[in-house]
Interface confidence: low
């Protein structure tokens, strides 16, 4: 059966569409294309004679159409008025005519949208903001993006006005964006320039970095204070309660043991009127903290397979360290039966299986040092099972 197919079905204004023909009969005299769902001479676009390979334009020809020997019709520079049905009539050599109708839809290229806002400088936990995507157009889908991701599900986010308007209830500092709106139709999509919110907040409790407590005499002490705040916080430093300077960073060259003490960072936001402080202890000493060798203990070292469980414990007196476990040079846990708990200090295996037999050890580490325990050997026994019917398992 004769059929036509539009390539593409949805066409962008100004582009081209090809009306493809399938199952074209072999013995033909010619064929004609018509605008509409039926053969109408007043609406003929073009006729094509096979013998002369001659194309003849019809009354509905706009000069943008091209017919091919395989009967396909190309329409270039389409407009929205071209939307609709097209009918092909094939004149076969047995003079029995066949017809097939197809259609396509022309959509406009969408303009670049823009975002309008009712409040660009909201206060955290207090203000609401409504964004509106402009312009309003027909047959258009409106989408919103926050941080280049689609809208998360949140009771603080509300869509209205056919998704053209996005409302943020009770903004937080994390709502700065950027926000973009996108308009779509079947042939085009366009995204707005990003819009950001200047959310006033803070300061939060300051953080003093680096986190080191111990320093060696003769070193340079360089402390930096940071508190999340908008506008940025103003900082000041106190040492043992005595004001030093109003800077974000504190630098003391060539420190001595006399520089040990309490270092206080004070952060102030002049807009919110809020203040926060953090105190850090600095110890200047010749001693260099080294991670000590941890101890490893087992609740039992010989267990029955598929029946018993075992707990391995890694003990250390050091603070500020992390723990990891190893078995046959593989890091653990390596199976569902292995669980770590109490800050990785305890490794539980439940139940123990034959493949769990072997050497275990733990390692404690911090950013500058690490140490391993002595290995511990876990033995796994299996109770002899009676054979059924005197047959050996095979």
């Amino acid at each position: 059966q004769l059929t036509t197919e539009s390539m593409p079905f949805n066409v962008a204004e100004g582009k081209e569409v090809l009306l493809l023909v399938h199952n074209l009969p072999q013995q033909l005299f010619g064929y004609s294309w018509y605008k509409g769902e039926r053969v109408d001479g007043n609406r003929q676009i073009v006729g094509y004679a096979i013998g002369t390979q001659q194309a003849t334009p019809g009354p509905a020809n706009s000069g943008r159409e091209t017919i091919y020997p395989n009967a396909s019709l190309l329409i270039q520079n389409v407009t929205q008025n071209d939307t609709g049905f097209y009918t092909l009539q094939v004149i076969k050599s047995d003079l029995v005519n066949e017809e097939a109708t197809g259609q396509f839809h022309v959509y406009p290229e969408l303009p670049k949208p823009s975002i309008s806002s009712n409040n660009s400088n909201p206060v955290e936990d207090k203000d609401a903001v409504a964004f509106t995507c402009e312009p309003e157009t027909q047959d258009t889908t409106y989408l919103w993006w926050i941080n280049n991701q689609s809208l998360p599900v949140s009771p603080r986010l509300q869509l209205s006005n056919g998704n053209r308007t996005l409302t943020l209830l009770s903004v937080t500092r994390n709502d700065t964006g950027p926000y973009e709106c996108e308009i779509q139709n079947p042939v085009s999509a366009n995204r707005s320039d990003p819009v950001t919110l200047n959310v006033t907040y803070g300061p939060d409790t300051p953080t003093i970095s680096p986190s080191d407590t111990y320093y060696r005499p003769g070193a340079n002490l360089s402390l930096s204070c940071y508190a999340a705040s908008n506008p940025p916080a103003q900082y000041s430093w106190l040492i043992n309660g005595t004001f030093q300077q109003s800077t974000q960073e504190l630098f003391i060259p060539n420190i001595t043991v006399n520089n040990s003490g309490s270092y206080t960072c004070h952060a102030n936001n002049s807009v919110t009127g809020c203040n926060r402080t953090t105190v850090k202890t600095i110890i200047v000493t010749e001693l260099s903290p080294v991670v000590a060798k941890p101890q490893i203990k087992a609740s039992k070292t010989t267990v029955t397979g598929d029946k018993d469980s075992v707990n391995l414990t890694c003990s250390t007196n050091d603070t500020g360290i992390s723990i990891r476990w190893f078995f046959k040079n593989q890091s653990l846990p390596s199976s569902e039966r292995m669980k770590l708990s109490q800050g990785n200090t305890t490794l539980s295996i439940n139940p123990v299986k034959r493949e769990d037999a072997g050497t275990y050890w733990c390692e404690v580490f911090n950013p500058i040092s690490k140490n391993q325990s002595d290995p511990i050997m876990l033995n796994v026994n299996y109770n002899a099972l009676p054979q059924e019917n005197g047959l050996s398992p095979g």
Epitope: S222, V291, P367, I368, S369, K370, N371
Partner: antibody, heavy 121, light 111 residues
Framework: EVQLLESGGGLVQPGGSLRLSCAAS????????MSWVRQAPGKGLEWVSV????????YYADSVKGRLTISRDNSKNTLYLQMNSLRAEDTAVYYC??????????????WGQGTLVTVSS | QSVLTQPPSASGTPGQRVTISCSGS????????VSWYQQLPGTAPKLLIY???RRPSGVPDRFSGSKSGTSASLAISGLRSEDEADYYC???????????FGGGTKLTVLG
């Protein structure tokens, strides 16, 4: 594609100075610690200096302390090595190298092609 | 004299497995991660192994690293002629506050 391109090498007399540059591209330069490593002709690798991603921490090999100075300009994606009071034993190919671990597990995953510094009278 | 000690040379025939050792102390290998680098003649070094035993993407699994105490080793299985190169181990040294390399091992693929 990550690229490190050293320049500034050449022939210099003992006691003289040179400034090496390493232009970085293909990655966020300001997120990586950077090192200089050198290799004397026919010899092995010798680490020279490291600078943290923000420039706040700097270390030098004992053999170059006080004579060589490492620095960086993150706005230009460039690493530098200022070489003063040069000696014959500073003759080497100088490589710049990137440390992807920010110094927590120092290693050098990308190296430049090297620039030759010859100290001779 | 390098802080990390490597054999100056090693050799093997194609298809063989060879191992290169690297010996240090508690201030470097014992308490820090080891890396291995390959330097083909006339080229810059290339990272083969980092963090004792991890391979960067693109490095064949014929190369493997291990560490025990204050020693590390690089194993190359299924040796190929293109593996002929200098191999260096390296680690951060807590005492020197600097990165240290081994003296390098020249690997020759025979035959």
């Amino acid at each position: 594609e990550v690229q490190l391109l050293e320049s500034g090498g050449g022939l210099v007399q003992p006691g003289g100075s040179l400034r090496l540059s390493c232009a970085a591209s293909g990655f966020n330069f300001s997120n990586y610690a950077m090192s200089w490593v050198r290799q004397a002709p026919g010899k092995g690798l010798e680490w020279v200096s490291v600078i943290s991603h923000g420039g706040g921490s700097i270390y030098y090999a004992d053999s170059v302390k006080g004579r060589l100075t490492i620095s960086r300009d993150n706005s230009k994606n460039t690493l530098y090595l200022q070489m003063n009071s040069l000696r014959a034993e500073d003759t080497a190919v100088y490589y710049c190298a990137r440390d992807p671990t920010k110094g927590y597990a120092p290693t050098f995953d990308y190296w430049g092609q090297g620039t030759l510094v010859t100290v001779s009278s | 004299q390098s802080v990390l000690t490597q054999p100056p040379s090693a050799s093997g025939t194609p298809g063989q497995r060879v191992t290169i050792s690297c010996s240090g102390s508690s201030s470097n290998i014992g308490n820090n991660y080891v890396s291995w680098y390959q330097q083909l003649p006339g080229t810059a070094p290339k990272l083969l192994i980092y963090a004792d035993s991890r391979r960067p993407s693109g490095v064949p699994d014929r190369f493997s690293g291990s560490k025990s105490g204050t020693s590390a080793s690089l194993a190359i299985s299924g040796l190929r002629s293109e593996d002929e190169a200098d191999y260096y181990c390296g680690a951060w040294d807590l005492s020197l506050n600097g990165y240290v390399f081994g003296g390098g091992t020249k690997l020759t693929v025979l035959g």
